[in-house]
Amino acid sequence: AGVFELQIHSFGPGPGPGAPRSPCSARLPCRLFFRVCLKPGLSEEAAESPCALGAALSARGPVYTEQPGAPAPDLPLPDGLLQVPFRDAWPGTFSFIIETWREELGDQIGGPAWSLLARVAGRRRLAAGGPWARDIQRAGAWELRFSYRARCEPPAVGTACTRLCRPRSAPSRCGPGLRPCAPLEDECEAPLVCRAGCSPEHGFCEQPGECRCLEGWTGPLCTVPVSTSSCLSPRGPSSATTGCLVPGPGPCDGNPCANGGSCSETPRSFECTCPRGFYGLRCEVSGVTCADGPCFNGGLCVGGADPDSAYICHCPPGFQGSNCEKRVDRCSLQPCRNGGLCLDLGHALRCRCRAGFAGPRCEHDLDDCAGRACANGGTCVEGGGAHRCSCALGFGGRDCRERADPCAARPCAHGGRCYAHFSGLVCACAPGYMGARCEFPVHPDGASALPAAPPGLRPGDPQRYL
């Protein structure tokens, strides 16, 4: 585990006489903010996953108003770093997208308007723990200067943040099977341990000391079931103590999406689904062509050579929306078999399997009958993640321990009387009927004839007699 850090040094017009005018004016003061999206650079997932390594949004920069007649300088920037925590190993090669957004602070109805000023992208090799790497990129008429680095969060160390280190318990050597942590020779490698008390059924961890809850469970140790029955509203942050969902204001209240965009709530904010021809955080960017790169997440743009003809984004697997901006809920495809619980972790799908099943998609049926006994001569049948007994005649129940009443289902037809017998049942037929279940009428001349097949049997089906 660790943190990717991005420092924006400057954003301003590129060199040359064709430099752009300031994006802000006296009539429309504005401020900048930045978004960074990271993907593993060489993984198969990179093309089809959104920011699989993580994403971050900067704070808003200072408000800037253009001075009339003055050339556009480098614009005032937000304070601080953009930090993207990563849970797993640092991949070494990564892809980035950095977007510069403008927030207009004029008298817009419904709050400030956002528009995308510039977007740069690249793929780089970077070892965690190394020095800051610098970059200069042009995007349209703008020039962006930035630095980035990846650093491990203790106790992780190494160029991929995969080795875990703890201070030595004894001064001379590390514990059995644990090596010293170079270059921190006074520390030792440590095994991965979840937070003490983390529920083994409802919690899991991907870094030491963590306890992350499966869907439907909450609390620091994932032992509290989420119950919304006593809650007033299904909106708002979850309370770890009660598991209740506390009411709060809705991010979609007043519909922040412009140009006919539809708003849907996300855990942290809202998301606009834009009609074709519009994009941006609030669907505020229009007159878009393929040249503007409107297709997100590796979508392929077709058509739209001029602003009057709409473009179409062909989305890669896992994405949808007119700009491929929406992730498909991969769990809605129910990839986990045999009742497994689906977890969409962003960078991967994970299935938590029910007892008796295993495999990435819970597709392997473990031996349900191992160690299971069926009483009274019953035989064990595998399936469904739990054993089932096929009981011998006269017995029933989960383990064939219950003596069955063979006459309970009234098996004797035409008024025949049923008697339980050690081998099953015997029917005493009413006058005029014969057969193991009294199913055949006896004809006056003493001959018997098979009638039309009774319900559930076709003529010629083998009749089963006890």
Partner: antibody, heavy 117, light 107 residues
Framework: QVQLVQSGAEVKKPGASVKVSCKAS????????IHWIRQAPGQGLEWMGY????????EHNQNFKDRVTMTRDTSTSTVYMELSSLRSEDTAVYYC??????????WGQGTTVTVSS | AIQLTQSPSSLSASVGDRVTITCRAS??????LAWYQQKPGKAPKLLIY???SLEDGVPSRFSGSGSGTDFTLTISSLQPEDFATYFC?????????FGGGTKLEIK
């Protein structure tokens, strides 16, 4: 105006080294990187690497392994590229260019290096 | 390294013609593509960067388009000074790589 002026043509023997200079003017020297690109006769363009004059950080194409060294002298706004262990296939025109990671906006006039025994 | 394939490798056209040169990348490079013009005995000159941004001082008859893996350089009406060799260059990954070039000749 922005100008990059390179040193003159060189003739070298195989195994020797060559050092080409690139003097920048017309802009703040430390504001942009200097890249080196070469072009063999009748061939395409091949990026060799760059130096950041502010930090002296360099990155180069793995095709050149440890044969290329880039340095700079801020007092004269000059960047140098040295290529060692020369072989005949290093015969090419060597260009310096100003830029960032996704643009090379001004180029030097080129320096012809001939490697011949 | 990312490979760039330019087509055609050579092209004959007349003054006033509309000419299109294409460049295909071996993988998605977003919009990180530049176009350069090179005349015999001269250094390359930047025409287009980030797929469609025209460099200062370059005539507006030059335009670039595309994103992802397929890119196009268009000269809307050829002028005598446009006969040269054109190279595309990707800047998404390190090392930056160039296409093989398209030689534009007078018909």
């Amino acid at each position: 105006q922005v100008q990059l002026v390179q040193s003159g043509a060189e003739v070298k023997k195989p195994g020797a080294s060559v050092k080409v200079s690139c003097k920048a003017s017309g802009y703040t020297f430390t504001r942009y990187w200097i890249h080196w690109i070469r072009q063999a006769p009748g061939q395409g363009l091949e990026w060799m690497g760059y130096i950041n004059p502010t930090t002296v950080y360099t990155e180069h194409n793995q095709n050149f392994k440890d044969r290329v060294t880039m340095t700079r002298d801020t007092s004269t706004s000059t960047v140098y590229m040295e290529l060692s262990s020369l072989r005949s296939e290093d015969t090419a025109v060597y260009y310096c260019a100003r830029g960032g990671s996704n643009f090379f906006d001004y180029w030097g006039q080129g320096t012809t290096v001939t490697v011949s025994s | 390294a990312i490979q760039l394939t330019q087509s055609p490798s050579s092209l004959s056209a007349s003054v006033g013609d509309r000419v299109t040169i294409t460049c295909r990348a071996s993988e998605n490079i977003y919009y990180n593509l530049a176009w350069y013009q090179q005349k015999p005995g001269k250094a390359p000159k930047l025409l287009i960067y980030t797929a469609n941004s025209l460099e200062d001082g370059v005539p507006s008859r030059f335009s670039g388009s595309g994103s992802g893996t397929d890119f196009t350089l268009t000269i809307s009406s050829l002028q005598p000074e446009d006969f040269a060799t054109y190279f595309c260059k990707q800047a998404y990954d390190v090392p930056p790589t160039f296409g093989g070039g398209t030689k534009l000749e007078i018909k």
